[in-house]
Every structure is written in C-alpha cells, then in structure tokens.
C-alpha cells in the first residue's frame, strides 16, 4: 500500500514538473510575442510617421533644391567626419556650384557664425590634385584658396565664404549631404 502511495506521489510530482515546464515555455512564448508585437508596432509607427511627414529631409537637416544638409555640433578629424556622415546615409558635403556654395555659407552664417567645417574634398598625395570624395574634380572656382604647408594628408574645409585647406587630422565641425526624398505626389 505504502509503495503504491509513493508511486502515485512520484507520478504527481513528475506531472507537476511537466506543467511547470509548460508554464515556463508559455511565459517565454508570451514574452517573445509581446516583444515582437512591440517591435512591429514601433516599425509600423515609424513607417506611418514617415508616410505622414514625408518631408524631403530628416529633422534638423536643411534643404536646398535636391539636397539635404546636416551641420554637425561636434568636432572630429576628416576621416571620422566622413564615417559619421555615412552612419546617417550621407557623405561629407560636395559643393557642385557657386550657388550651392552661397547657400551653404549663408546658412552657416545664420546658424553658427565663422567656424571651420570639413567638406568632402581632399588632395591626392602624389599628384597634388584636389578631388571630391566620389573621384570628381572641383570646378575651377571651387578650389581651396591656400595650399596647406602640411606634410600630412590635406583636406578641404569651409570657413565664412571661403574654401580652405588643412591637415586632415585637425579637429573641425563638418557638414553632411544626402539626396532629398522626392515627393511621390
């Protein structure tokens, strides 16, 4: 009789362990679903807000024609500035025309005043040629005014309404550029 009771007790304990496991699995599953739901809601929220505010440029970016510009609030060396822009899906500013240069310098005057801002221009160490980061040559009117006396790599920056050159390892603010979103209307 005692043996029978202890067998039943063991079976009941086993059942209880299985139920606890099942409950644990269910709780985990429920938590996972809740997380997925949260993620989906966040994703939908983002998609909806982008659909509603389908503004051509992200918040805190300035628009001019087909471009969006971001003026940094931190200093960094030229290469790090480039990487910071890439993280935002943009590149360092590439000035294509006098009109664009005027827009940038005018905007900087309004925002911050006379500081140095890296742009996507660097000097080839061998040939001494200035090239934009995409490999294209600047138009003649958009070449840095002074040749830097640096033995290190030389990069371009904007200050006031001038394009100048400096050792790429110096710390400056920077300007990122990306294409503005085209309106689907």
């Amino acid at each position: 009789k005692l043996l029978q009771v202890s067998t039943i007790a063991m079976q009941q304990q086993e059942k209880l362990i299985q139920q606890e496991r099942a409950l644990l699995n269910f709780t985990e599953w429920k938590r996972s679903c809740a997380l997925q739901m949260k993620y989906c809601q966040a994703f939908m929220q983002n998609s909806l807000s982008s659909a509603h505010n389908s503004s051509p440029c992200p918040n805190n970016w300035i628009q001019n024609r087909e471009s969006c510009y971001y003026v940094s609030e931190i200093w960094s060396i030229w290469h790090t500035s480039q990487e910071n822009c890439l993280k935002e899906g943009s590149t360092l500013l590439q000035i294509e025309s006098k009109e664009e240069m005027d827009f940038i310098t005018g905007s900087l005057r309004k925002i911050k005043g006379s500081y140095d801002y890296w742009v996507g221009l660097s000097q080839d160490g061998h040939s001494g040629r200035w090239l934009w980061q995409d490999g294209s040559s600047p138009s003649p009117g958009l070449l840095p005014a002074e040749r830097s006396q640096s033995a290190n790599q030389v990069c371009g920056y904007v200050k006031s309404n001038s394009l100048l050159s400096s050792n790429c390892s110096t710390w400056k603010y920077f300007i990122c550029e990306k294409y503005a979103l085209r309106s689907s209307v």
Partner: nanobody, 115 residues
Framework: QVQLQESGGGLVQPGGSLRLSCAAS????????MGWYRQAPGNQRELVAA???????VYGDSVKGRFTISRDSAGNTVHLQMDSLRPEDTGVYYC?????????WGQGTQVTVSS
C-alpha cells in the same frame, strides 16, 4: 543583428581586375551605408570605398579612378570592382555596414596582387 558575407578575393597579377561582393542579412533595414575597408600587414584599416542608401559614393584617395563601388537593386549586396590593381592594393578587404547605432564588420577576404 546584421551579418556580412564577403566573397571574390584571390591572387591577381598587377594590372589585373577583381570583383568583391558583400551580402548583408539580418537587420538590413537599419543599414544606412555600406563600405569596404582594407588592412595591409602592419597598417591600420583604411576606407577604400563606401556607398549610401541614396547611392552617394566615397572613395579613398589611392583608389580613385580605379575602383568602383555599386549595390544591387535590392540594396543588400555591395560590389567593389577593382581595376588596374597594384601590389600596394594587397591586404585583407573587410565589408562594413554603417547604422546609426553599431557598425558591423565582415570576416574579411584576402586580396593579393603579385606577379
């Protein structure tokens, strides 16, 4: 979590060409730009080329005019066409995905330019 898989490395003669590919999987919606870096023995990793989601491109000074970066229409594979290769292009080429938060690196693929 973004995973990156590089392919296309190998041994090539000076003046030759190679095409590297990098396929991204995982959280690809968070990727804003993708690029290639290289590291020669004893040197730091340097940016070779990068491309943003919008198609803007960036090249390292030493490869301008010789290398071309592009991405497929789906946007999750990036290609690096390397022409007029030189011995100094030898190194391990790493793919990198840029996001607002973390950046992700591939395992690297060896490129050797030698006669």
């Amino acid at each position: 979590q973004v995973q990156l898989q590089e392919s296309g490395g190998g041994l090539v003669q000076p003046g030759g060409s190679l095409r590297l590919s990098c396929a991204a999987s995982g959280g690809i919606s968070s990727i804003n730009s993708m690029g290639w870096y290289r590291q020669a023995p004893g040197n730091q990793r340097e940016l070779v080329a990068a491309i943003t989601n919008g198609g803007r491109t960036v090249y390292g000074d030493s490869v301008k005019g010789r290398f071309t970066i592009s991405r497929d229409s789906a946007g999750n594979t990036v290609h690096l066409q390397m022409d007029s290769l030189r011995p100094e292009d030898t190194g391990v080429y790493y793919c990198k995905a840029f996001t607002r938060g973390d950046d992700y690196w591939g395992q690297g693929t060896q490129v050797t330019v030698s006669s």
